[in-house]
């Protein structure tokens, strides 16, 4: 019989709200033997995988996703999903990035919320909607805004 | 890499019929297949697809008259009680590495003919 | 259910010109789309998804645009080898399954 597998988790590193150009990294997490996880956006078409998967824990494992120079197109919802064979998990709930110009003027707040606020708690997905809608990836050029289809 | 199509041939009206798409060359758990159809001098038409997470999905018209299913290696598409307008080839095709809205892998198709 | 109208159904230019192809969604499907091109007895092929991003393979005189519900395929430079039907297809998978429906397809003719 097939084990249930645990919804993954999603943080960003150093948190969900990002200066323009500065980097971001994506951690999503899962049980131990976990073969792929795989970083899907909302609202996009286009999603990254890695099987670059490490030990986070005795009974957890991790990958990383990195973006070097953040972009307004990089800001909107992210999840994660992972592989252990011969399965696919559930999806994370939602991770909200933030991006903020650099340039504060006086009407720009110095802080926002950081990563504390965690993923954006929405329903989970339906069994049909696990493309509800996916990434865009990690490639400098898929930049674009973000829009809400739902 | 590669899909192909198989599975298909004469029967009579009311006859189920399973085709199967076979992968090659790549692991299909990472992928979304469509089967699309093609009638005789007719443009192309969306019957359903299996998801990478193990999902389908129908066409309105499909729902009822087909089922998809897969394996670690195929997917097949199961024609539970063709009629005459089911003749058409028969295409599966794979999506692109990395983004889900483009099938750059096709199928040669398998001919399907319904007939009495 | 998600409509595509493709227009225009058929189109004739000579060669070293441009054609432009439309295609309507009745619905917003954001980046979930794509560009085919298909000649008689062969199976498809992708020539543009996400929906301005060039397949592997194709060349630049083929140009994708457009989000959304409104989406444009330009041909220029228009060689002999291009003549085919084309069609376009959304392939969203969403919280309001949309699915992957075609456009109606519209044939290219060079002269």
């Known amino acids: 019989q097939e084990e249930d597998l645990p919804r993954p988790s999603i943080s960003a590193e150093p948190g969900t709200v990002i200066p323009l150009g500065s980097h971001v990294t994506f951690v999503c997490r899962g049980p131990v033997g976990v073969q792929t996880f795989r970083l899907e956006r909302e609202s996009r078409s286009t999603y990254n995988d890695t099987e670059d998967v490490s030990q986070a824990s005795p009974s957890e494992s991790e990958a990383r996703f990195r973006i070097d120079s953040v972009s307004e197109g990089n800001a909107g919802p992210y999840r994660c999903i992972y592989y252990k064979p011969p399965k696919w998990s559930e999806q994370s709930d939602y991770l909200e990035l933030l991006v903020k110009e650099t340039s504060g003027g006086p009407d720009s707040p110095d802080t926002e919320p950081g990563s504390s606020a965690g993923p954006t708690q929405r329903p989970s997905d339906n069994s049909h909607n696990e493309h509800a809608p996916a990434s865009q990836g990690l490639k400098a050029e898929h930049l674009y805004h973000h829009h809400h289809h739902h | 890499q590669s899909v192909k199509e198989s599975g298909g041939r004469l029967v009579t009206p009311g006859t189920p019929l399973t085709l199967t798409c076979t992968a090659s060359g790549f692991s299909l758990y990472k992928y979304n297949i469509q089967w699309v159809r093609q009638a005789p001098g007719k443009g192309l038409e969306y019957i359903g697809a299996?998801?990478?997470?193990?999902y389908t999905y129908y066409a309105s018209w499909a729902k009822g008259r087909v089922t998809i299913s897969r394996t670690s290696t195929t997917v097949d598409l199961k024609m539970t009680s063709p009629t005459t307008e089911d003749t058409a080839t028969y295409f599966c095709a794979r999506h692109i590495d990395g983004d889900y809205s483009g099938y750059a892998l096709w199928g040669p198709g398998t001919l399907v003919t319904i007939s009495s | 259910e998600l409509v595509l109208t493709q227009t225009p159904a058929s189109v004739s230019a000579a060669v070293g010109g441009t054609v432009t192809i439309k295609c309507q969604a009745s619905q917003s499907i954001g980046t979930w789309f794509a560009w085919y091109q298909q000649k008689p007895g062969q199976s498809p092929k992708l020539l543009i998804y996400?929906?301005?991003k060039l397949a592997s393979g194709v060349p630049p005189r083929f140009k994708g645009s457009g989000s959304g519900t409104e989406f444009t395929l330009t041909i220029s430079d228009l060689e002999c080898a291009d003549a085919a039907t084309y069609y376009c297809?959304?392939?969203?998978?969403?919280?309001?399954?949309?699915?992957?429906?075609f456009g109606g397809g519209t044939e290219v003719v060079v002269k």
């Open positions: 996400g929906p301005s």
């Open positions: 299996s998801t990478y997470a193990g």
């Open positions: 297809q959304s392939t969203y998978f969403g919280v309001d399954y949309l699915g992957g429906t």
